[in-house]
């Protein structure tokens, strides 16, 4: 498999058959698949060097792994997008052997003197062809030469099989399955041959191709493949339940932010709640996690403005649940990214020198910002797309707080909507879905560069649009939701999560 290890070294060779038998639309589809693969790999913070070859009668090398920009995913994608099927029109035979020899030439080193670290570099060849080679001879001989070069299968104690993966995608109207199978790697419990039909569900294909065991602690990563559970798609999501004898129970959501902490809303708890009465589950697991302590933001005080006629005051409505035992990360349990951390800098593929302010400008620009939250409907987690009103609609969004029960007599809305809040909901630019009571404490998320970054904690809403946890179809335009802006509570997060190795900026 493609081992995505951010500390490892990898070369990926993209080889695309542009011969007559492929056809323009299949060529375009294959290109799209490769573009998606480049993005998927880049989302892991891995920066492999890419080689890019198209071929028919002759190969054309568009990107060499030795080029300085070969590890710049955006640049490689640009080169790939600029390739046309017509480029091989005049010499449109199929010489797969020559194309693989072009890959071999990129792998090999001058004067037979291997560079430092050559033996730690993994090589991945992704060949998109119909397998109908009609000139140049059998391409399998070049695969053998490549194996020889990389010293694969020669040492009984160290076969190095994981240093070469050859994936073959059968593209085109007619595919020679025998030839394709012969070229692809053969490894136990792994799939290295894919058909055109597979390319309709690329996430499923990538799931078969990628080994992310070295990057399970990466924040904001998800798997969207068809066989995945809700928690493959939202692996940070935590369900919180507070059992109160003779008073029923309160349901909330939260987000895994580190191996020991779940971030949620403070209002989910009262000062009387004992740790043993708080149930937290993650990854869709039945068992509850043991809780060490709930840490409230020191400035949170729901009764803080009762004298001023404000019955409930949600400023600083955030809490961290500290778990007794370390979470074991896996594909259904992994953290979400937090603002102003090194992990988020890497997730957004920003320079290491990026400041907290620059992250804020990237994630919360002064405009309508596409975001999402996760809600549970009929025991299924679903993503709800909303827009954070952070530009010209911000004022009107915040003013609608006056329609919230108990806030009708508030003279100045900034008394309840403090600078700590982000506002979503309403009908412009689109009709946003609203949060339900049980969504409280869950993350408000910005999805960027294939990663998920939490920017807010769901706190309170103007209108209860959910009857029995079912959203009403028709909701008033003033149905707004307010979320604690994590950029505004960073000092507290930084202090409480200082031992969690999140690398706060």
């Amino acid at each position: 498999k493609i081992v995505l290890d951010p500390s490892g070294s990898m070369n990926i060779y993209l080889v695309l058959d542009g011969s007559d038998s492929i056809g323009a639309s299949n060529f375009t589809g294959a290109k799209k698949c490769l573009v998606n693969l480049i993005e998927k790999v880049a989302s892991y913070g891995v920066k492999p060097r890419y080689g890019l070859v198209t071929y028919a009668t002759y190969p054309k090398i568009w990107v060499k792994v030795s080029e300085a920009d070969s590890s710049n995913a955006d640049w490689v994608t640009k080169q790939l997008n600029e390739i046309n099927y017509e480029d091989h029109k005049l010499k449109s035979g199929t010489n797969t052997k020559k194309a693989l020899q072009a890959v071999y030439s990129m792998m090999s080193w001058p004067d037979d003197v291997p560079p430092e670290g050559w033996n730690r570099t993994r090589h991945v060849i992704i060949l998109m062809t119909d397998g109908l080679h009609n000139m140049g001879g059998d391409p399998i001989t070049v695969i053998d030469e490549i194996r020889d070069l990389l010293y694969i299968g020669k040492d009984r104690k160290n076969p190095r099989e994981d240093y070469l993966d050859v994936y073959v995608f059968g593209v085109g109207p007619l595919v020679n399955q025998v030839n394709i199978n012969a070229l692809a790697s053969k490894k136990d419990n792994e799939q290295h041959v894919f058909k055109v039909k597979d390319m309709e569900n690329l996430e499923d294909v990538f799931y078969q191709m990628i080994d992310e065991s070295q990057s399970l602690s990466l924040c904001g990563m998800v798997w969207e493949h068809r066989k995945g559970t809700d928690y493959h798609k939202q692996p940070w999501q935590a369900k919180i339940s507070v059992i109160r004898p003779s008073k029923g129970h309160e349901s909330c959501m939260g987000a895994v932010v580190s191996e020991y902490f779940v971030l949620t809303a403070a209002h989910c708890f009262t000062v009387d709640d004992k740790e043993h009465s708080i149930k937290v589950s993650v990854g869709g697991e039945k068992r509850d996690l043991e809780i060490e302590v709930v840490l409230f933001h020191p400035n949170y005080n729901i009764n803080g403005k009762k004298e001023a006629g404000i019955p409930e005051f949600y400023d600083y409505d955030v809490a961290l649940i500290k778990l007794k035992n370390k979470l074991k990360y896996g594909q259904t349990i992994r953290p979400i990214c937090l603002p102003c951390t090194e992990g988020t800098t890497r997730a957004l593929r920003l320079p290491p020198t990026t400041t907290c302010q620059q992250q804020k400008e990237e994630l919360l620009p002064a405009q309508d910002i596409k975001a999402l939250f996760v809600s549970e409907e009929e025991k299924k987690l679903t993503r709800k797309e909303v827009y954070i009103k952070n530009g010209d609609k911000k004022g009107s969004c915040e003013r609608d707080a006056q329609y919230a029960p108990g806030y009708d007599k508030v003279k100045d809305i900034s008394e309840v909507v403090t600078p700590r809040f982000l506002c979503t909901g309403g009908v412009s630019p689109y009709a946003d879905p609203n949060t339900c009571r049980g969504d409280s404490g869950g993350p408000l998320i910005v999805h960027k560069r294939s990663r998920f970054i939490q920017v807010g904690v769901i706190s309170w809403g103007v209108v209860d649009v959910c009857k029995n946890q079912k959203r009403q179809k028709q909701v008033p335009a003033h149905a707004r939701d307010f979320h604690i802006n994590l950029f505004q509570v960073l000092p507290w997060l930084k202090e409480k999560l200082q031992d969690e190795d999140l690398g706060f900026l």
Epitope: D112, P114, N119, Y151, K154, D155, R156, K157, N158, R160
Partner: antibody
């Protein structure tokens, strides 16, 4: 055809030095471990050390009895293995063999004919 | 280091007889499903010759009357029917752990 030929043996005084060479042909030298083995008169075989193949950067390994006194090196451009022997003792008198150590099964599948080293005053 | 003890030190047999040579290791020479034990034959004035590798695999060009068996710490070289040219010294050698080591040898002589 695989061939290994040792050279450089001879008479040397105790405390002296000697460098043995092992020229090879018929195989891709850099892809193999290469070992030195010796045999004292009337005694058994004693493994002295090897030079690993290219994946391991040709790093050497030594038997405790010669560590610090003997050095194994190779010149891949000349397909030649070397054994530099320093501070020689009378008990180092032996026939010295070089052998190709096949990493496909970690066994010495080809041997040279041997070269005699006599340490005597 | 792994110490290899061969038995017997000397074995006197006649041509046509079956020879069984033993080799015991001070610790296991198995790794990842393979036994890294090799057998060599040496005749006077000649370099050793590989007979068996990885405990039971016959090196190419070696007659089929030679066979090897065993795993872990106990290994056997068997010559099913001795030919006159088989009388020589036989060494076992382990390549599982560095440093490699040889047994002291078994001398197979004509009775």
């Amino acid at each position: 055809e695989v061939q290994l030929v040792e050279s450089g043996g001879g008479l040397v005084q105790p405390g002296g030095s000697l460098r043995l060479s092992c020229g090879t042909t018929g195989f891709t030298f850099r892809d193999y471990y290469m070992s030195w083995v010796r045999q004292a008169p009337g005694k058994g075989l004693e493994w002295l050390g090897f030079s690993r193949h290219r994946v391991y950067g040709y790093t050497p390994e030594y038997a405790a009895s010669v560590k610090g006194r003997f050095t194994i090196s190779r010149d891949n451009s000349k397909n030649t293995l070397y054994l530099q022997m320093n501070s020689l003792k009378t008990e180092d008198t032996a026939v010295y063999y070089c052998a190709r150590d096949n990493p496909g099964y970690y066994a010495m599948d080809y041997w040279g004919q041997g070269t005699l080293v006599t340490v005597s005053s | 280091e792994i110490v290899l003890t061969q038995s017997p030190a000397t074995l006197s047999l006649s041509p046509g007889e079956r020879a069984t040579l033993g080799c015991k290791a001070s610790q296991s020479v198995d790794y990842d499903g393979d036994s890294y034990m090799n057998w060599y034959q040496q005749k006077p004035g000649q370099a050793p010759r590989l007979l068996i590798y990885a405990a039971s695999n016959l090196e190419s060009g070696i007659p089929a009357r030679f066979s090897g068996s065993g795993s872990g710490t106990d290994f056997t070289l068997t010559i099913s029917s001795l030919e006159p040219e088989d009388f020589a010294v036989y060494y076992c050698q382990q390549s599982n752990a560095d440093p490699y080591t040889f047994g002291q040898g078994t001398k197979l002589e004509i009775k």
